[in-house]
Interface confidence: low
């Protein structure tokens, strides 16, 4: 019968002819009366056989990632009779892996959004690289992830590619970060190949800033002839947050005379000082009122940022009008 061994050829072999192994019948006594033949896809082109000895050679470079095995057929003939000595038999030559493929991130580009001020350990995104080498062949496709850019704000789990927050970030200081992740095969050992990917991490706003008045004192004037409901001027606060977190409401904190009111222009986020009661120069020619400003929406957990409302003082001068 046939004497079989397993046949392996390392991929990317640079030798012009690489000895793969030998076909042998146990009836072959070595007197050169047998002729071995190789049939099937790759016979005569990729693989050749020494017909006298049964030695098989690979005569071209093989790429395991293109083709990982070859199914060939073996024949052995007795030259003196021209008859087959053994039944034709199928056998396999496996192409063994070398580390010739770098890890690739196939889902690029990566982008993630995470709330500012998220605590350490918050999961941001998972990046995954794939390696075309053989996962069952040593460490050729065993990957380790590392952070090339993004410290100290981010970290990556070496075996999973999960990116987490490692330090709190303030959107008002920087609203996006580019993180560069490297995946190295051979679990990072020398001779490893690697690939890199970039992850754009954007910080979404949380309401961690209260509105603050631009001025601590506003001076306005009102004519004694002005009817009630007249807008006598505007005041303005600023808020470092964005969107609805920057929406604010103005109100009167102190007005003993109850002469004025403040309404909020939600388009411009300005406070409009309104005359609530008519004024009389001869009766009172100036007023002092205090206004305050607060965010429109404040989350319960974020109340710590909004304890003291910002206030401003408004001095209002009444202008005299000649009366008939």
């Amino acid at each position: 019968g046939w004497v079989w061994n397993q046949f392996f050829v390392p991929e990317e072999m640079n030798t012009t002819s690489h000895h793969v192994g030998r076909l042998r019948s146990d009836l072959d006594n070595g007197n050169n009366s047998f002729q071995y033949k190789l049939l099937g896809a790759g016979a005569g082109s990729t693989f050749i056989i020494d017909e006298r000895t049964g030695d098989i050679y690979a005569i071209e470079k093989l790429d395991r990632e293109e083709r990982s095995l070859y199914i060939l057929r073996a024949q052995v003939i007795d030259i003196t009779t021209g008859r087959a000595v053994e039944p034709e038999s199928e056998f396999v030559i496996k192409v063994s892996d070398i580390n010739d493929n770098e890890p690739k991130f196939l889902d690029e580009p990566y982008e993630a959004i995470v709330p500012e001020m998220s605590p350490e350990g918050t999961l941001v995104i998972q990046v995954t690289a794939s390696d075309a080498d053989d996962p069952s062949s040593g460490n050729n496709a065993r990957l380790l992830y590392s952070l090339l850019q993004g410290q100290p704000y981010f970290s990556v789990e070496p075996t999973t590619g999960v990116i987490r927050i490692s330090s709190k970030m303030d959107r008002e200081l920087q609203d996006e970060y580019w993180v560069i992740i490297q995946a190295k095969d051979m679990i990072g050992q020398p001779g490893a190949l690697s690939g890199t990917t970039s992850v754009l991490i954007k910080l979404s706003d949380v309401n961690d800033n209260k509105p603050i008045f631009k001025e601590s004192l506003y001076r306005l004037t009102v004519s004694e002839s002005a009817p009630t409901g007249t807008s006598i001027g505007t005041i303005m606060a600023y808020d470092n947050d964005i969107g609805e977190n920057a929406e604010m409401d103005y109100s009167i904190e102190e007005d003993d005379s109850q002469t004025f009111d403040i309404i909020t222009n939600h388009e411009t986020q300005e406070g409009i000082v309104i005359l609530k009661k008519k004024v009389n120069f001869e009766h009172q020619n100036h007023y002092g009122i205090r206004a305050k400003v607060k965010n429109h929406h404040v989350d319960e957990q974020l109340m710590k940022y909004h304890t003291e409302a910002s206030t401003t003082f408004i001095k209002i001068q009444v202008e005299d009008v000649d009366e008939p």
């Epitope: 770098e102 560069i180 020398p190 490893a192 690939g195 890199t196």
Partner: antibody, heavy 120, light 111 residues
Framework: QVQLVQSGAEVKKPGASVKVSCKAS????????MSWVRQAPGQGLEWMGI????????TYAQKFQGRVTMTGDTSTSTVYMELSSLRSEDTAVYYC?????????????WGQGTLVTVSS | QSVLTQPPSASGTPGQRVTISCSGS????????VNWYQQLPGTAPKLLIY???QRPSGVPDRFSGSKSGTSASLAISGLQSEDEADYYC???????????FGGGTKLTVLS
């Protein structure tokens, strides 16, 4: 065929800086590392550092740390090497050389070289 | 003083076989691929051998590379006058985290 075209020769005074450019074409610029190698007159090749144009991550030879800056512009497929605090011993031909997909893979294509002369 | 040691010069007559050695350490040749560059007078270096023994297309098979342990060598058989050039070995060094070149070998073809 891959092409790397470098900027022209420069003459600089000691203490000045020089910025050499290397424009790449006919390959995916962001997939390969780019190294800078210099050669002083009559001397051998000396590796200065490497940059990955897509992430901009760099590794510099210890000798040049603090004096060299390598940058890349993906919109023009160009890498730059700036060397500061020049001294006469920086007179050399500076080459850009395309690396592999990772640091330890060979440089397969080289620019034509840029002669930088440092003289007072 | 280069991290990789090459003989400063080598010579041979046309048709001869010449070998250029490159000696390093575990952190460079011992751990990584060796590459060889040819630099003809007045030109940029050209890749001759990569990953120890591979020839880029266009490089004649008279050039071959090998590596054993912490040493490597470049062999040129059937020497020709146009082979007169400087030859450099280069390898990535894991402990330096960077590339290192040999000092170069000037090959002279004697007529």
């Amino acid at each position: 065929q891959v092409q790397l075209v470098q900027s022209g020769a420069e003459v600089k005074k000691p203490g000045a800086s020089v910025k050499v450019s290397c424009k790449a074409s006919r390959y995916t610029f962001t997939s390969y590392y780019m190294s800078w190698v210099r050669q002083a007159p009559g001397q051998g090749l000396e590796w200065m550092g490497i940059i990955h144009p897509s992430g901009g991550d760099t590794t510099y030879a210890q000798k040049f740390q603090g004096r060299v800056t390598m940058t890349g512009d993906t919109s023009t497929s160009t890498v730059y090497m700036e060397l500061s605090s020049l001294r006469s011993e920086d007179t050399a031909v500076y080459y850009c050389a395309r690396g592999g997909i990772k640091l330890w893979l060979h440089f397969d294509y080289w620019g034509q070289g840029t002669l930088v002369t440092v003289s007072s | 003083q280069s991290v990789l040691t090459q003989p400063p010069s080598a010579s041979g007559t046309p048709g001869q076989r010449v070998t250029i050695s490159c000696s390093g350490s575990r952190s460079n040749i011992g751990s990584n691929f060796v590459n060889w560059y040819q630099q003809l007078p007045g030109t940029a270096p050209k890749l001759l051998i990569y990953t120890n023994n591979q020839r880029p297309s266009g490089v004649p098979d008279r050039f071959s590379g090998s590596k054993s342990g912490t040493s490597a060598s470049l062999a040129i058989s059937g020497l020709q006058s146009e082979d007169e050039a400087d030859y450099y070995c280069a390898v990535y060094d894991d402990s330096l985290n960077g590339w290192v070149f040999g000092g170069g070998t000037k090959l002279t073809v004697l007529s």
